[in-house]
């Protein structure tokens, strides 16, 4: 006996109660492939989720996050609260980054400032809660007598000639 269900297209299901007739998916359900024996319930975008694409008989709804939240996971399976730059989301909500750490985004965690000395460099611009430090030349490059393509002009006080 040939399985008549394989003839049922997407958007329908094979109704065993009706001699394997292809019946349309009921409202708020879909089947994205042919030959289905049931239709899947459409995803509902509620609360912090908003609808990006409505459900149809052949495809599920797609959700985004409302303003102030961002998507996490495949197909926006979660919405996570945004924080301000310089903060991270903790068990108690958005909290400022601890001294020595920064976050330049509305999501994610506070990360430690770059340790310039590990690369033999000096701190050119100090770090903040929102920004990493900027590393500059190594201290050796800045010391007197260090060779460079353009030697620095000698520092002198006004009215004094160089020795």
């Amino acid at each position: 006996l040939q399985d008549l269900c394989s003839n049922c297209p997407a958007g329908t299901f094979c109704d065993n109660n009706r001699s394997q007739i292809c019946s349309p998916c009921p409202p708020n359900s879909f089947s994205s492939a042919g030959g289905q024996r049931t239709c899947d319930i459409c995803r509902q975008c509620k609360g912090v989720f908003k609808t990006r694409k409505e459900c149809s008989s052949t495809s599920n709804a797609e959700c985004d996050c409302i303003s102030g939240y961002h998507c996490l996971g495949a197909e926006c399976s979660m919405c996570e609260q945004d924080c301000k730059q310089g903060q991270e989301l903790t068990k108690k909500g958005c909290k400022d980054c601890c001294f020595g750490t920064f976050n330049d985004q509305k999501r994610g965690i506070c990360r430690p400032w770059t340790n310039c000395s590990l690369d033999g460099k000096s701190v050119l611009v100090n770090g903040t809660k929102e920004r990493d430090v900027v590393c500059g030349p190594s201290p050796a490059d800045l010391s007197p007598g260090a060779s460079s393509a353009t030697p620095p002009a000698p520092a002198r006080e006004p009215g004094h000639s160089p020795q």
Epitope: R43, K46, G47, V48, F49, C63, L72, G73, C76, S77, M78, C79, E80, Q81, L89, T90, K91, K92, G93, C94
Partner: nanobody
């Protein structure tokens, strides 16, 4: 069919109190963590309070000391007692399940109520 139905909202003067209720049906309420969230006109949606299945609670800094979340598993209901209300508490308040157990994060399997309006004004 899962349902969350909020009630208890209304108009109250600054300094006044309200108790919101959220009646749950269609799922095993006692094993779910629950949350209250709110959205004020022109403001971002924000979480207010959470309660774990074991009764442990979390509060947003903005409501700490004024709001109390509680649950009655026998009645499948979660409550939000709101005292010392301020005009900035004016919002639509939503009740929702809380699968992720991560503050500020909800997932696609969470259930949401339709919301109840709270207006704090003299």
């Amino acid at each position: 069919q899962v349902q969350l139905v909020e009630s208890g909202g209304g108009l109250v003067q600054p300094g006044g109190s309200l108790r919101l209720s959220c009646a749950a049906s269609g799922f095993t309420f006692s094993s779910y963590a629950m949350s209250w969230a709110r959205q004020a006109p022109g403001k971002d949606f924000e979480w207010v309070s959470y309660i774990y299945s074991d009764g442990n609670t979390y509060y947003a800094d903005s409501v700490k000391g004024r709001f109390t979340i509680s649950r009655d598993n026998a009645k499948n209901t979660v409550y939000l007692q709101m005292n010392s209300l301020k005009p900035e508490d004016t919002a639509v308040y939503y009740c929702a399940t809380w699968h992720t157990l991560r503050v500020g994060v909800w997932d696609e399997y969470d259930y949401w109520g339709q919301g109840t309006q709270v207006t704090v004004s003299s």
